[in-house]
């Protein structure tokens, strides 16, 4: 006899990285028969939603109107059908950004390189942080973590055309409080025709996304988006 229901799916809209004072909605998708959803924050009950007939809702939304560092952290949700509770969802790391300062991102030897060349990104921030994050725009969410007193190195090694794209970095004051994003650095990797044609294209965000780095998510893209979030969040853990 089944003692628990399958775990729900949790994600943030429009994004798990939320600029300070902006709004975010945490979504929890469970089962149409659910009579209660609970959102937990850092292990404690944070909010409850109870669909009632004639609602037939398999997804509930918990709205945070004004993001701040107190709201940043790990969220999970569970739901109940009758008396039976689900397994908890995966953890959602909600990050507050635009805290304090803006780092500077540079690339060596330069933004235009040849396939096979060794490339290193440098993220610099002169305030009290020792952890840095390098993000490549795109749903596959290449995120790297680096450490240093005021600067972190991110060696990409010998690059291929798959490394092409736009990069930004953040200073991280803790796992869930990040700086403003750096200005973007676009890496252009040239290679021979064969390499280029075989290079996997990285699906990227819309061009204006990183102004507030919010991903517009239509219903059909929610799972893709959450997958993007999940990949990025693996690094946070």
């Amino acid at each position: 006899q089944q003692q628990t229901l399958p775990k729900p799916f949790i994600w943030a809209e429009p994004h798990f990285m939320v600029p300070k004072e902006k709004q975010v909605t945490i979504c929890c998708q469970g089962n149409y028969g659910a009579v209660e959803y609970q959102l937990h924050f850092e292990g404690s009950l944070f909010a409850v939603d109870r669909p009632k007939p004639p609602e037939r809702i398999n997804k509930v939304q918990f709205y945070i109107p004004d993001m701040n560092s107190r709201m940043a952290g790990q969220y999970s949700c569970i739901y109940r059908v009758g008396e039976l509770w689900s397994e908890p969802s995966n953890l959602l790391d909600l990050v507050v950004t635009e805290m304090y300062d803006t780092p500077t991102l540079s690339v060596h030897p330069g933004p235009e390189v040849i396939s096979g060349e060794k490339v290193t990104f440098y993220c610099r921030l002169d305030t009290a942080t020792s952890m840095f994050l390098l993000l490549k725009e795109g749903r596959s969410s290449h995120v790297q973590r680096g450490y240093g007193k005021v600067q972190a190195e991110f060696p990409l090694g010998p690059v291929t055309t798959a490394h092409r794209g736009t990069y930004r970095c953040f200073g991280s004051y803790n796992n869930h409080a990040w700086s403003f994003p750096s200005e973007p650095v676009k890496l252009l990797v040239t290679g021979d025709i064969e390499n280029t044609s075989l290079a996997p294209e990285d699906p990227t965000f819309p061009a204006d996304t990183w102004g507030t780095y919010l991903l517009t998510t239509e219903t059909g893209l929610q799972k893709d988006h959450a997958l993007w979030d999940h990949t990025a969040q693996n690094l946070l853990r």
Epitope: P53, P54, I57
Partner: antibody
């Protein structure tokens, strides 16, 4: 597209039973949602009568509870309203309606029932 | 039973005007409130559920707000097709109960 159609007698005598059928096409009544009867009195006041849910469970308006029954025939994809011991106060347009938010609801066009003595 | 009191019972408004209809419950209904529109000669249709959530396919000029006992439906810019009767419905407790309706006519 879900369509609902009410049918039944337009005229019922006082103290008799009123029986209405709602035929549903384009969606199985066992799949999901709440299958309601709602009536609208002359003067436009709306009253929720009751529902049978996708799983066969019922909820009725207590003001009608001892004389109401909502049942279904899943093989015909129909659900039914039976109201016993009717009075002239049961004169109304009766709607069957599928409700299941956030989906757009679906209603029948309504059937007018007059109770006469 | 929970009594739902709607106001006004009827109103005239001009095209393009912002229109607000209110509904007051006899007790706290915890935002379990929906709004219906009934066009002349037609069946009702739900616009909003859970006080402020738009039903799929409803134009964004409709919005709902409120909590506790007091709720409102707003049409941001009235269109001709919006004329009809508007009802609120509480579904916090059985029996579900409707408001008396607001007849909206074009000035």
């Amino acid at each position: 597209d879900v369509q609902l159609q009410e049918s039944g007698p337009g005229l019922v005598k006082t103290s008799q039973s009123l029986s209405l059928t709602c035929s549903v096409t384009g969606y199985s009544i066992t799949s999901d949602d709440y299958w309601n009867w709602i009536r609208q009195f002359p003067g436009n006041k709306l009253e929720w009568v009751g529902y049978i849910s996708y799983d066969g469970s019922n909820n009725y308006n207590p003001s009608l509870k001892n004389r109401i029954s909502i049942t279904r025939d899943t093989s015909k994809n129909q659900f039914f309203l039976k109201l016993n011991s009717v009075t002239t106060e049961d004169t109304a347009t009766y709607y069957c309606a599928r409700l299941g938010y956030p989906a757009m609801d679906s209603w029948g066009q309504g059937t007018s029932v007059t109770v006469s003595s | 039973d929970i009594k739902m009191t709607q106001s006004p019972s009827s109103m005239y408004a001009s095209l393009g005007e912002r229109v607000t209809i209110t509904c007051k419950a006899s007790q706290d209904i915890n935002s379990y409130l929906s709004w219906f529109q009934q066009k002349p000669g037609k069946s009702p249709k739900t616009l909003i559920y859970r006080a402020n959530r738009l039903v799929d396919g409803v134009p964004s000029r409709f919005s709902g707000s409120g909590s506790g006992q007091d709720y409102s439906l707003t049409i941001s810019s009235l269109e001709f097709e919006d004329l009809g009767i508007y009802y609120c419905l509480q579904y916090d407790e059985f029996p579900w109960t409707f408001g008396g309706g607001t007849k909206l006519e074009i000035k």
